[in-house]
Interface confidence: low
């Protein structure tokens, strides 16, 4: 791996769907310094979960959060 990596990268992605009620917000990781594009969900416990933006459950979860909150996501 790289000698130094930003702490906002996702190195692996969640294999299982995260229950919607546990999700609070999300942000996209698109930095070229990271190994892969990802979405980081913030849970109600303020803990982060990395997920694959190409997965349907991830897209559905982002839509759900978008509908819950009028503020645009980065």
């Amino acid at each position: 791996g790289p000698a130094s990596v930003p702490t906002t990268c996702c190195f692996n992605l969640a294999n299982r769907k995260i229950p919607l009620q546990r999700l609070e917000s999300y942000r996209r990781i698109t930095s070229g310094k990271c190994p892969q594009k990802a979405v980081i969900f913030k849970t109600k416990l303020a803990k982060d979960i990395c997920a694959d933006p190409k997965k349907k459950w991830v897209q559905d979860s982002m839509k759900y959060l978008d509908q819950k909150s009028p503020t645009p996501k980065p």
Epitope: G1, C10, F11, N12, L13, I40, L45, K47, I49, C50
Partner: antibody
Framework: QVQLVESGGGLVQPGGSLRLSCAAS????????MSWVRQAPGKGLEWVSN????????YYADSVKGRFTISRDNSKNTLYLQMNSLRAEDTAVYYC?????????????WGQGTLVTVSS | DIELTQPPSVSVAPGQTARISCSGD??????VYWYQQKPGQAPVLVIY???NRPSGIPERFSGSNSGNTATLTISGTQAEDEADYYC??????????FGGGTKLTVL
């Protein structure tokens, strides 16, 4: 059921090399990250190294960085740990373990371990 | 790496409740995992994501995590629960950190 079987341990002199293998079965090996965790005799668990499911990224504990190399062959469902420049303090039972979920790492299944003894 | 601190030993009478603590700076902001290890055996995951039990783990095992301390609770402790227990968390660099382990003795 998930099975992880380590092999390749043994007695080696300081400065020597050893290659550990971990044969996986009972799950889709290529879909999971894999790790090596060691345990010195009578001591606690120490994380050694991680490798991503596709093998593209690897991570090491500072204590082994530059001496150990983790790799995998997804076509053979096998994980490896190449250990060079071995020291007495590397003496331990080495476990391979499967991990899932992130950005954190945790181990949902472990092998039974293989003992590495570094001594002259 | 996050430094995790566990008591070296905890004793409990059969049928009583055992509590094993794991402390670390802002540990409640991370998920904590607990492993049981019996002599000569590999570790077994008993709690994941702070308070979830994998299938096959008895209901008497539970976990919590807030502030700087995570706790593994074993209700109605049985003789077969005598083992070493390790807490584990992680760092942003995809590494794992273990506590020093706690030897649970069932009196």
């Amino acid at each position: 059921q998930v099975q992880l079987v380590e092999s390749g341990g043994g007695l080696v002199q300081p400065g020597g090399s050893l290659r550990l293998s971990c044969a996986a079965s009972g799950f889709t090996f290529r879909s999971y990250g894999m790790s090596w965790v060691r345990q010195a005799p009578g001591k606690g668990l120490e994380w050694v190294s991680n490798i991503r499911s596709d093998g593209s990224y690897t991570y090491y504990a500072d204590s082994v960085k530059g001496r150990f190399t983790i790799s995998r062959d997804n076509s053979k469902n096998t994980l490896y740990l190449q250990m060079n420049s071995l020291r007495a303090e590397d003496t331990a039972v080495y476990y391979c373990a499967r991990f899932e979920f992130t950005p954190w790492t945790y181990f949902d299944f472990w092998g039974q371990g293989t003992l590495v003894t570094v001594s002259s | 790496d996050i430094e995790l601190t566990q008591p070296p030993s905890v004793s409990v009478a059969p049928g009583q409740t055992a509590r094993i603590s794991c402390s670390g700076d802002n540990l409640g902001k991370k998920y904590v995992y607990w492993y049981q290890q019996k002599p000569g055996q590999a570790p077994v995951l008993v709690i994941y994501d702070d308070d979830n039990r994998p299938s096959g783990i008895p209901e008497r095992f539970s976990g919590s995590n807030s502030g700087n301390t995570a706790t593994l609770t074993i209700s109605g402790t049985q003789a077969e629960d005598e083992a070493d227990y390790y807490c584990q968390s992680y760092t942003a660099q995809s590494s794992a950190s273990f506590g020093g382990g706690t030897k649970l003795t069932v009196l």
